[in-house]
């Protein structure tokens, strides 16, 4: 675990150009705040780190769908 506690992030000023394997991802949040410079998706990894990604990229959309399916299956 990190040595100090994180607070929720608000904006992505840049996005990653590397594809993150789906098995490393735990959840995601859409960033649509009008005050942020760009629309983005923030993935949370199983390690607890956050990754800014471009929702226009195919791997990002596929990862979001996959995580949606996982959460849907968890619902009673």
């Amino acid at each position: 675990q990190p040595d100090s506690v994180s607070i929720p992030i608000t904006c992505c000023f840049n996005v990653i150009n590397r594809k993150i394997p789906i098995q490393r991802l735990e959840s995601y949040t859409r960033i649509t705040n009008i005050q942020c410079p760009k629309e983005a998706v923030i993935f949370k990894t199983k390690r607890g780190k956050e990754v800014c990604a471009d929702p226009k990229e195919r791997w990002v959309r596929d990862s979001m769908k996959h995580l949606d399916q996982i959460f849907q299956n968890l619902k009673p």
């Epitope: 100090s4 994180s6 992030i9 904006c11 840049n14 990653i16 590397r18």
Partner: antibody, heavy 119, light 107 residues
Framework: QVQLQESGPGLVKPSQTLSLTCTVS??????????WNWIRQHPGKGLEWIGY???????YYNPSLKSRITISIDTSKNQFSLTLSSVTAADTAVYYC???????????WGQGTMVTVSS | DIQMTQSPSSLSASVGDRVTITCQAS??????LNWYQQKPGKAPKLLIY???NLETGVPSRFSGSGSGTDFTFTINSLQPEDIATYYC?????????FGQGTKLEIK
């Protein structure tokens, strides 16, 4: 294009505290998803990861150095810093700052700054 | 901590040769491995991530493979500008650890 630049004293006396700063240009240190790291390389040797800080202040330190290091961030100056206390000759190294985009790959590095510990 | 063992520690090869470097982890790290190139007096540069994915802008003569504990880094046709030291880095566990490096020279 984000660039990193280390700065600090090139010579530190044994038992003193080493302080280094990394200035981020071409982008905001406050961006989500960026983890700001310190890595060092002893002369003629391999690389040793020291620790990281997130813009929120969240840190993780290498346990081998944890008792002696502090990594801090100043978002107003677009800088993050390393302090290493009680230095010895074994802390003589090139110190690099580097960014990872949350996926644990160091994709942007500073050019490195050589720090010698000597009386 | 996970120990990363690279071999060989140094090697000499001719322009056009196929060069292979290996990295062995002390425990299973899946494919959580990166490769870096460090030229003399310069900072390391990311070449390969997730064991086999080429970083943007890196020439296709570089490649990586492997999973678990055994990994391979290959330069398909060695070029003079490839003179450097190459490092593997695992990220399965924190703290991150690097191999000791492989110094590549041209014959």
């Amino acid at each position: 294009q984000v660039q990193l630049q280390e700065s600090g004293p090139g010579l530190v006396k044994p038992s003193q505290t080493l302080s280094l700063t990394c200035t981020v240009s071409g982008g905001s240190i406050s961006s989500g998803g960026n983890y700001w790291n310190w890595i060092r390389q002893h002369p003629g040797k391999g690389l040793e990861w020291i620790g990281y800080i997130y813009y929120s202040g969240n840190t993780y330190y290498n346990p081998s150095l944890k008792s002696r290091i502090t990594i801090s961030i100043d978002t107003s100056k677009n800088q993050f810093s390393l302090t290493l206390s009680s230095v010895t000759a074994a802390d003589t190294a090139v110190y690099y700052c580097a960014r990872d985009g949350g996926d644990d790959a160091f994709d942007i590095w500073g050019q490195g700054t050589m720090v010698t510990v000597s009386s | 901590d996970i120990q990363m063992t690279q071999s060989p520690s140094s090697l000499s090869a001719s322009v056009g040769d196929r060069v292979t470097i290996t990295c062995q982890a002390s425990q299973d790290i899946s494919n959580y491995l990166n490769w870096y190139q460090q030229k003399p007096g310069k900072a390391p540069k990311l070449l390969i991530y997730d064991a086999s994915n080429l970083e943007t802008g890196v020439p296709s003569r570089f490649s990586g493979s492997g999973s678990g504990t055994d990994f391979t880094f290959t330069i398909n046709s060695l070029q003079p500008e490839d003179i450097a030291t190459y490092y593997c880095q695992e990220y399965n566990n924190l703290p991150y650890s690097f191999g000791q490096g492989t110094k590549l020279e041209i014959k």
